[in-house]
Amino acid sequence: MMTGTIETTGNISAKKGGSVILQCHLSSTMAQVTQVNWEQHDHSLLAIRNAELGWHIYPAFKDRVAPGPGLGLTLQSLTMNDTGEYFCTYHTYPDGTYRGRIFLEVLESSVAEHSARFQIP
């Protein structure tokens, strides 16, 4: 039975040219996290973090995606095209698969604030 929940940073905004941390957290379960996949709005792969093999960063993003902190992902040199949904997929044992969603808005404004409160989707 899947008892866990994914908490995410929810809806966040960040400045064009800046960076943002995408973070999900699995709680309320003792399941072992074996792999976390990070995907972009069009479901294209950004990165994989395998518990035993480490990180795989999609090659086209390697110059502006940094692994971590933890199981999260840091997206750098943001462009307006980065606006959209991001998904974390947690493969766990024995529970199975959990999925979280984050919406990132990249703002032109120099006063853009990076809001990053955790929330349950």
Partner: antibody, heavy 119, light 107 residues
Framework: EVQLVQSGAEVKKPGASVKVSCKAS????????MHWVRQAPGQGLEWMGR????????KYNEKFKSRVTITVDKLSSTAYMELSSLRSEDTAVYYC????????????WGQGTTVTVSS | DIQMTQSPSSLSASVGDRVTITCRVS??????LAWYQQKPGKSPKLLVY???TLAEGVPSRFSGSGSGTDFTLTISSLQPEDFATYYC?????????FGPGTKVDIK
């Protein structure tokens, strides 16, 4: 065109070390992880480890962990695999293989380097 | 370690035949499975990754299916250049492991 060109065949004595090179071209070397896989004569494939050429960080198969070292030279776009304390059962073809776009599989392979361990 | 078994270990077939190779895995690997083709004296060639995605340049007569612990590689109409050994590999944990191979030869 992606190419992985490996160094030539080696004959080594038991207890010695061997260092195999793999020169990459046709793509951005630091953007793709590199794996090493070996194949004993008439046998299947055995994964040895992988490296991130950008950071130099590596992961190894526990079976080889104490004997294998995978390194890179970013300037020459070359990956290296060194295996120490060689024994006769290390006689095999050693392959470098580039990691694929979408995970930990390998999409391009070198031509292989035959390592023979014999007294 | 994740254990991989393949069946059959070898098969004889004719040009035009439909060929199916099975790979069974000791634990759930979701869809993280690749298939490779290897000809004698040559390096392995990637055919399929993520269980069903055809690698670039691979003919459409090849197809992969399955998830969890049971996977299949199908060649819809065997061609002369398809006689080779086929290996499955999980790409989900350390160590990455390969199946023992299935040799496809001419009947």
């Amino acid at each position: 065109e992606v190419q992985l060109v490996q160094s030539g065949a080696e004959v080594k004595k038991p207890g010695a070390s061997v260092k195999v090179s793999c020169k990459a071209s046709g793509y951005t070397f630091t953007n793709y992880y590199m794996h090493w896989v070996r194949q004993a004569p008439g046998q299947g494939l055995e994964w040895m480890g992988r490296i991130d050429p950008d950071s130099g960080g590596s992961k190894y198969n526990e079976k080889f962990k104490s004997r294998v070292t995978i390194t890179v030279d970013k300037l020459s776009s070359t990956a290296y695999m060194e295996l120490s304390s060689l024994r006769s059962e290390d006689t095999a073809v050693y392959y470098c293989a580039r990691e694929g776009h979408y995970g930990f599989y390998s999409d391009y392979w070198g031509q292989g380097t035959t390592v023979t361990v014999s007294s | 370690d994740i254990q991989m078994t393949q069946s059959p270990s070898s098969l004889s077939a004719s040009v035009g035949d439909r060929v199916t190779i099975t790979c069974r895995v000791s634990e759930n690997i979701y869809s993280y499975l690749a298939w490779y083709q290897q000809k004698p004296g040559k390096s392995p060639k990637l055919l399929v990754y993520n269980a069903k995605t055809l690698a670039e340049g691979v003919p459409s007569r090849f197809s992969g299916s399955g998830s969890g612990t049971d996977f299949t590689l199908t060649i819809s109409s065997l061609q002369p250049e398809d006689f080779a050994t086929y290996y499955c590999q999980h790409h989900y944990g350390n160590p990455l492991t390969f199946g023992p191979g299935t040799k496809v030869d001419i009947k």
